[in-house]
């Protein structure tokens, strides 16, 4: 299964499969999610270790048990791969690194007035992984606001220095967010030229194409189909890369086929994974396991849940047969992909899914009327649960903002149905960002089902919360997808990185926003909450997040919508925005229904007909 | 030139049989999947069934399964459908088609259809 | 098995139009998904596959979109030889469905 834990001064000892240098423990942690064979992950930072060649080392380990012995390393992190956690698998990594030099090699330099600035520049340029940025105090001044566009072999920096007066990250491609757009059209009987930077044996263009987009240094590739003319070169994938970005030439080659990586696509990336069976076919590989299961689909899915399975065979001979039941051979190679692909065979073959965003889960959980004011725009992907709830009556308005927690489930203020409880007249949009983007012709989705809390009283602010089955399942994709639900009763974790969003007033007296907005406030311990609201009862089911000043908090419009907080590199849904006095008063934190304390009953009403709950456990 | 011929389409009684051909000529027979199509009179068309390029992996669609056959002679560069039992329902142009390689399991490649009718 | 939905059913244009189709699978078939165009008495055409890739010798008015489970086939200026039925397909998992057609007819 998913296991989302970090190790804290931990290190695991041998099972090594790869190395790099990784400004942190997450990037660390996602490169270890896209390794073929990386299972476990151990982390260097720059203060656990004196050895100037392993400050910032990421080592990728591999063990056929699934774990390995751990060390103790002060200031060590070690934790697991993300594979098989559906929604939580993402090449995209937006942190900047202050004081941080990622090194590689530099191909272009720019002077930009900001940081972000440099960031775009480098998801806007096709050959860019990372960049570094000299802030204006940088100690020398003809260095200063340079931004420096850089790539390496690996797509991971060469090496990572401590530098005063820098910042570093990574390119926005893998979040859908390059303006640069893709070529989705591929070309049959059209052979590129270049560079390969890689070579793997695929059965379609479609899948050589999705390892291509997800490969750091693939910008297109040639297939060559199983009718090709030279029998050794049949299925094999090239990946390629220019010095222009763009194949220099192209040569009209029968039973072949040709296209570009989709890293640069606005909006929608392919899933990392592949999800299509193959009849017919046989993958060869390493073989890991064989057992007897009924169909193949089922063998997928047995391909799936063995962590370090890659691809199957599913076999349909006679004597690989027994009643209804037939071999099922688990396989892996050292790339991910078959070593061979024969044709022509009683068998049908695919690849797991442990790669994919969307697994069958409803809910994310983990084990362990009320815009925002003070706040600031959001960019496309930053909150990718965030939804607004609007009403179609005879004009459409945006009510309230909700959560959304799984592929049919958001999660809401009860307050937000108070004299609107019918389903018909709302409309839920998902993975938008702009309010005006919304046309007749926006997609969105229909209720099918509203649940509110048993003990919710209108005008009364407790148990203020209710759930939204929706009438048909979403997609997740980079700007539509769930946020992971606090373990039950959570108290022990402590919380300090705490955003609301929405699209509410910006002051008391406002109006709807636009732009989703943003807002990070502080927790506020409900003894001084309860404080403030003398005439309320601030009870251990609420959570209060404010500034003594004001000045910062949600407000109408917000309602229903999330408080979050990231922990260990994780978003988790704490608390539903619920009321206040006023918005962003002095000594008037904003109120929050507690999450954690209702897990019980999210369980309880998210459970499939079949009376097994639908959620996802990452730890 | 890249051509699809089918043939043995005809009246035949409820309950009766059928066997249908497809000729493939100016490419690889062996190395394609091919599949059966049929369109009822006024209709859309209907996936009926699928053959591998062995022939080793056969599938149909369930208004079919357990009375049709599907099979190929790659010597003879001929693709079958073997039709018993048949139903009125059944009544429709049959055609033989041809699957993409290496792209989108798309079919490329078309015959111009038999006519079948089941009717007493 | 994976239902393709077509809609409209039927759709009447002009020439110089632009005209949407759209199709929806009842689940994610990733961009396997193929357009074809048929003529009264003719065997379909294959126009698109992958969802957004011209089969050779299409012209290129013809262009299709989408991933997952909803798609799109556009024809951005409606040519006299283009009315006729458009079928979607997905060829993502057996049986490979068809959409039950729209019927593109002269206004």
């Known amino acids: 299964g998913c296991l989302t834990q970090l190790y804290e001064n931990a290190f695991f000892r041998g099972g090594d499969v790869a190395s790099m240098y990784t400004p942190n423990a997450q990037y660390c942690q996602m490169r270890c999610t896209f390794h073929p064979r990386c299972l476990l992950f151990s982390f260097l930072p720059a203060s656990s270790i004196n050895d100037m060649e392993k400050r910032f080392g990421c080592f990728l380990k591999d063990s056929v048990t699934g774990t390995l012995p751990k060390v103790h390393r002060t200031g060590a992190v070690s934790g697991h791969s993300l594979k098989q956690c559906g929604h939580q698998i993402s090449a995209c990594h937006r942190d900047i690194y202050k004081g941080v030099d990622m090194r590689g090699v530099n191909f272009n330099v720019s002077k930009v007035s900001s940081v972000e600035e440099c960031q775009k520049r480098c998801t806007s340029n096709i050959r860019c992984q990372f960049f570094s940025y000299a802030t204006q105090t940088f100690h020398k001044a003809e260095y200063r606001n340079n931004c420096l566009l850089k790539y390496s072999p690996g797509g991971t920096p060469t090496a990572i220095k401590v530098l005063s007066n820098v910042e570093s990250g990574f390119s926005l491609k893998p979040c859908a967010l390059s303006e640069i757009g893709c070529h989705m059209n591929i070309f049959q009987h059209l052979a590129f030229s270049d560079v390969d930077v890689a070579r793997v044996l695929t059965p379609d263009a479609f899948v050589c194409r999705t390892i291509c987009t997800y490969h750091p240094n693939c910008l297109f590739f040639t297939f060559y189909t199983n009718v090709w003319k030279i029998e050794s070169q049949r299925n094999v994938c090239l990946l390629k890369t220019s010095e222009s970005g763009t194949p220099s030439s192209s040569t009209p080659q029968e039973n072949t086929i040709s296209g570009y990586s989709l890293l640069t696509c606005k909006r929608t990336l392919p899933e990392p994974c592949h999800s299509k069976i193959y009849p017919g076919v046989d993958f060869g590989g390493e073989e890991l396991n064989v057992t007897f299961v009924k169909g193949v689909n089922v063998c997928q899915e047995t391909c799936t849940k063995m962590i370090r399975c890659q691809f199957f065979t599913y076999s349909l001979l006679p004597e690989d047969c027994k009643e209804e039941k037939c071999k099922c051979f688990l396989r892996l190679s050292m790339d991910g992909s078959p070593t061979r692909i024969a044709y022509g065979t009683q068998g049908s073959s695919g690849y797991s899914l442990r790669l994919c965003n969307t697994g069958d889960n409803s809910v994310c959980t983990t084990k362990t009327s009320t815009r925002i004011v003070g706040g600031t725009n959001s960019s496309w992907g930053e909150w990718p649960w965030q939804v607004s709830l609007q009403v179609k009556l005879t004009a459409q308005r945006h009510l309230c903002g909700g959560s959304l927690i799984g592929h049919q489930w958001v999660l809401t203020a009860a307050h937000c149905f108070d004299g609107l409880p019918l389903q018909d007249v709302w409309r839920i949009y998902s993975g938008i960002l702009n309010l005006s983007d919304i046309t007749k012709d926006t997609p969105f989705s229909q209720i099918k089902e509203i649940i509110i809390h048993q003990n919710y009283k209108v005008s009364e602010g407790n148990h203020d919360i209710a759930l939204i089955k929706l009438q048909a399942p979403l997609n997740y994709t980079e700007f539509q997808k769930p946020i992971c639900l606090p373990s039950k009763g959570d108290t022990s974790t402590i919380y300090t990185n705490c955003w609301v969003t929405g699209w509410g007033f910006s002051k008391e007296k406002g109006e709807i926003q636009n732009i989703l907005q943003k807002v990070n406030i502080p927790l506020v311990t409900n003894e001084e909450c309860q404080k403030r609201y003398q005439d309320y009862k601030i009870t251990q089911r609420m959570v209060c997040a404010g500034y003594k000043e004001g000045g910062k908090d949600a407000c109408k419009g917000d309602s229903g919508g999330p408080l979050v907080c990231k922990h260990n590199g994780m978003w988790r849904l704490v608390g539903i925005t619920s009321w206040g006095e006023g918005c962003a008063r002095r000594e008037q934190p904003g109120v929050y229904t507690k999450v954690a304390e209702y897990m019980d009953w999210i369980l309880e009403k998210t459970q499939s007909s079949d009376g097994k709950a639908q959620m996802q456990s990452p730890a | 030139e890249v051509q699809l011929l089918e043939s043995g389409g005809g009246l035949v009684q409820p309950g009766g049989s059928l066997r249908l051909s497809c000729a493939a000529s100016g490419f690889t027979f062996s190395a394609y999947m091919m599949i059966w199509v049929r369109q009822a009179p006024g209709k859309g068309l209907e996936w009926v069934s699928v053959i591998y390029p062995s022939g080793g992996v056969t599938m149909y669609a369930d208004s079919v399964k357990g009375r049709f056959t599907i099979s190929r002679d790659n010597s003879k560069n001929t693709l079958y459908l073997q039709m018993n039992s048949l139903r009125a329902e059944d009544t429709a142009v049959y055609y033989c088609?041809?699957?993409?390689?290496?792209?989108?399991?798309?079919?490329?490649?078309w015959g111009q259809g038999t006519m079948v009718t089941v009717s007493s | 098995d994976i239902q393709m939905t077509q809609s409209p059913s039927s759709l009447s244009a002009s020439v110089g139009d632009r005209v949407i189709i759209t199709c929806r699978a009842s689940?994610?078939?990733?961009?396997?998904l193929n357009w074809y165009q048929q003529k009264p008495g003719k065997a379909p055409n294959l126009l698109i596959f992958g969802a957004s890739t011209l089969q050779s010798g299409v012209p290129s008015r013809f262009s299709g979109s989408g991933s997952g489970t909803d798609f799109t086939l556009t024809i951005s200026d409606l040519q006299p030889e283009d009315f006729a039925t458009y079928y979607c397909q997905q060829s993502f998992s057996d049986p490979y469905t068809f959409g039950q057609g729209t019927n593109l007819e002269m206004k």
């Open positions: 088609a041809r699957g993409t390689v290496g792209a989108s399991d798309a079919f490329d490649i």
């Open positions: 689940r994610s078939i990733a961009t396997y």
